[in-house]
């Protein structure tokens, strides 16, 4: 059998291999050692007994999509049946105090590979034996601790394979410089050690993508925007656009990246080298946002120019070095660059919203029959922008972290956007008050710290009689800045 017979459904073409040469990988036309690594078809009854206590699942993930030329990393994790795990020596053991269908196991080991004699396996002096080899016959690499690695992983893609000895998790990185663009299939077959041979325990496949477009994601955020994921934002407030480039192998680390923005509102093109940009829309409507990201990435050197037509008679000597038609691709240590582009497009809707909220006045409400521990305070609030439909207040500790009370209620506000919010405070002390005005699309927040002093019946009565003349003795409001809002607090006398 050949590798492609074992690992794939169909024999890949040489064309596929020629166009996708993976460094360090081998052609799947190579022979597979079926004696050492038996091959079972899907549905073969032997799969049921390939692992004690159930089936092992292999989970294959990758950091796809990969920009062509970058490295793509594949990770395979083995998921053992319940209550089983790999120990420090690479043996498979039962977890302590874990009960599965078979109950608690007396034997701590599922597979005790260490116990299997390392001396009596017919090794030569180098520590190499006829069975410490991969399916193609290549010997296992003797890394420190390699004997604790009891799984053989065979990766297969694009008509090529890669073999790796490992534990219950392995990682393989592949350079994509010569990989055809588009979706590709990676298949992995996993074998476990079994005496002097190996037994298949799991097969898994996953699609990965190689692209010549820089994978670009843009997060959009705006102060006071109620839902950042609905692509609806508020007029007259800056929107922050943050560009995230998916480049897990840091292929573009040394590239100059340019960001070219068109916001779709006739403000022209904006070019930046910063991945974050702010833009304010001053009109309502729907706008088409376009971003083009450009990076000079490492790439293949251009092909050499075609040789000049043959001269009629032989030339006596070589011309100067400048006339040498040696192509760039033949120069060793080539360091050419190619412009790669990424694109992002979104349609965003701009609407009116509540732009700002301010507490302009805080007033103690005098009660003729005051409660023993209760103070009522009125907050006079103004806003700019659209008219709010609800108000929420969150009363919390002075650090504004531990919520004590939260209340939301609908409001009916006139065009002037002036409203009074009354809230009760239980007991004296300092409180943080977060006050939020909201409508369908926006939420505007302001915060203030207030101090509520001890109150006794005499002072309350005196306050009632005097028309509130000693309010500053009762509490003081302190200004707090929140999200660059500047709140002007007026004490009412």
């Amino acid at each position: 059998k050949r590798f492609h017979d074992v690992l794939g459904n169909e024999r890949p073409s040489a064309y596929m291999r020629e166009h996708n040469q993976l460094n360090g990988w081998s052609s799947d036309e190579n022979d597979w050692n079926e004696k050492l690594y038996p091959v079972w078809k899907r549905g073969d009854m032997r799969w049921k007994n390939s692992w004690k206590g159930g089936r092992v699942q292999a989970v294959l993930t990758s950091d796809s999509p990969a920009l062509v030329g970058s490295n793509i990393t594949f990770v395979v994790n083995l998921v053992f049946p319940r209550c089983q795990k790999e120990d420090a020596n690479g043996n498979i053991v039962y977890e302590k105090n874990c009960r599965n269908e078979a109950g608690l196991s007396a034997d701590p080991y599922v597979y005790n590979w260490t116990a299997w004699s390392e001396d009596s396996d017919g090794e030569n002096g180098t520590g190499q034996s006829h069975h410490n080899v991969f399916p193609d016959g290549k010997p296992f690499p003797h890394h420190p601790g390699w004997r604790r690695w009891n799984f053989v992983y065979v990766f297969h893609t694009l008509g090529q394979y890669f073999q790796k000895l490992g534990r219950c998790s392995v990682r393989v990185s592949v350079n994509t410089a010569n990989v055809t663009l588009g979706p590709q299939l990676m298949e992995v077959t996993v074998y476990r050690r079994h005496g002097r041979a190996y037994v298949p325990i799991a097969q898994v496949k996953d699609v990965y993508v190689v692209t010549d477009q820089i994978p670009v994601f843009v997060t959009m955020s705006q102060k006071n925007d109620r839902n950042s994921s609905d692509e609806t934002f508020l007029k007259d407030l800056p929107i922050t656009f943050d560009v995230l480039i998916h480049d897990p192998s840091h292929f573009l680390n040394y590239s100059t990246i340019n960001y070219k923005w068109s916001f779709g509102d006739n403000t022209g093109l904006f070019v930046s080298i910063n991945h974050t940009v702010n833009h304010t829309y001053v009109l309502n409507g729907t706008f088409s946002l376009n971003l083009t990201v450009k990076a000079a990435a490492p790439g293949p050197c251009p092909p050499p120019p075609p040789p000049p037509p043959r001269p009629p008679k032989p030339t006596p000597s070589l011309g100067p070095a400048g006339d040498n038609p040696l192509g760039l691709s033949e120069i060793p240590d080539e360091n050419c660059q190619i412009n790669r582009y990424g694109h992002f497009q979104a349609t965003i809707t701009i609407v009116e919203g509540i732009l700002e909220v301010n507490i302009i006045q805080t007033t103690d409400v005098l009660m003729l029959v005051p409660g023993p521990d209760s103070s009522l305070i009125d907050f006079v609030v103004t806003c700019q922008g659209s008219i709010p439909t609800e108000v929420c207040t969150i009363i919390s500790d002075p650090t504004c972290e531990i919520t004590q009370n939260a209340v939301c209620s609908p409001v009916d506000v006139d065009e002037m956007c002036l409203l009074t919010v009354r809230r009760a405070f239980n007991g004296s002390g300092t409180y943080c008050v977060n006050l939020t005005l909201g409508d369908d699309t926006s939420l505007a927040l302001t915060s203030t710290l207030i101090s509520v002093p001890d109150r006794d019946p005499a002072s309350s009565l005196r306050m009632a009689n005097s028309g509130g003349g000693g309010l500053n003795d009762i509490f003081e409001a302190q200004k707090i800045e929140w999200h660059e809002h500047h709140h002007h607090h007026h004490h009412h006398h």
Partner: antibody, heavy 119, light 107 residues
């Protein structure tokens, strides 16, 4: 839909050069290799070479390596084949064709350009 | 280079007949063989790829089979519009090569 557009005909003199174009549309130009196939009048099909529009990599049959040069212009999604030192042997219909990813069969063909080499 | 040999340059047939065209590769190219139809004055049209896979929209009277070095293209019931030249092509390795073509004509 996928289209490969080629000019209908080119008349050139012996010894001259000609640059044939193939404008691609309806797909991501850089994602598929583009191939060129020659067909002399009344004869069969002969593969000339291929180019990867993403990075400019090329492959040619041995006998055209000094005759044909494949290039692309990504900005216009156009592939070119320049033929030099033309002789009557080069008179033929030249097709551009698109391969299927990792597979070198051709689901999409241009209409072909008839090159006539004549004094 | 891999040589693709179509043994018949011409084949005579009648409408409704079953006809098979053969193609032999000079080495194992399995399963990388495609079949094309070319009508006069037109570009070739892909019918079969990877020996036996019918391309999208191709009528099911066209089938492909074979492995190793021997491949067959079959039209189960020839229609008048099927009269054309048929080419095999190996897409196994570079340089890609075509058979010389088989012209299907009316008896």
């Amino acid at each position: 839909q996928v289209q490969l557009q080629q000019p209908g005909a080119e008349l050139v003199k012996p010894g001259a050069s000609v640059k044939l174009s193939c404008r691609a549309s309806g797909y991501t130009f850089t994602s598929y290799w583009l191939h060129w196939v020659k067909q002399r009048p009344g004869q069969g099909l002969e593969w000339i070479g291929e180019i990867n529009p993403s990075d400019g990599r090329t492959n040619y049959i041995e006998k055209v390596k000094t005759k044909a040069t494949l290039t692309v212009d990504k900005s216009s999604s156009t592939a070119y084949m320049q033929l030099s030192s033309l002789t009557s042997e080069d008179s033929a219909v030249y097709y551009c064709a698109r391969s299927g990813g990792n597979y070198a069969w051709f689901a999409y063909w241009g209409q072909g350009t008839l090159v006539t080499v004549s004094a | 280079d891999i040589v693709m040999t179509q043994s018949h340059k011409f084949m005579s047939t009648s409408v409704g007949d079953r006809v098979s065209i053969t193609c032999k590769a000079s080495q194992d190219v399995s399963p990388s063989v495609a079949w094309y139809q070319q009508r006069p004055g037109q570009s070739p049209k892909l019918l079969i790829y990877s020996a036996s896979y019918r391309y999208t929209g191709v009528p099911d009277r066209f089938t492909g089979s074979g492995s190793g070095t021997d491949f067959t293209f079959t039209i189960s019931s020839v229609q008048a519009e099927d009269l054309a030249v048929y080419y095999c092509q190996q897409h196994y390795s570079i340089p890609l090569t075509f058979g010389a073509g088989t012209k299907l004509e009316l008896k």
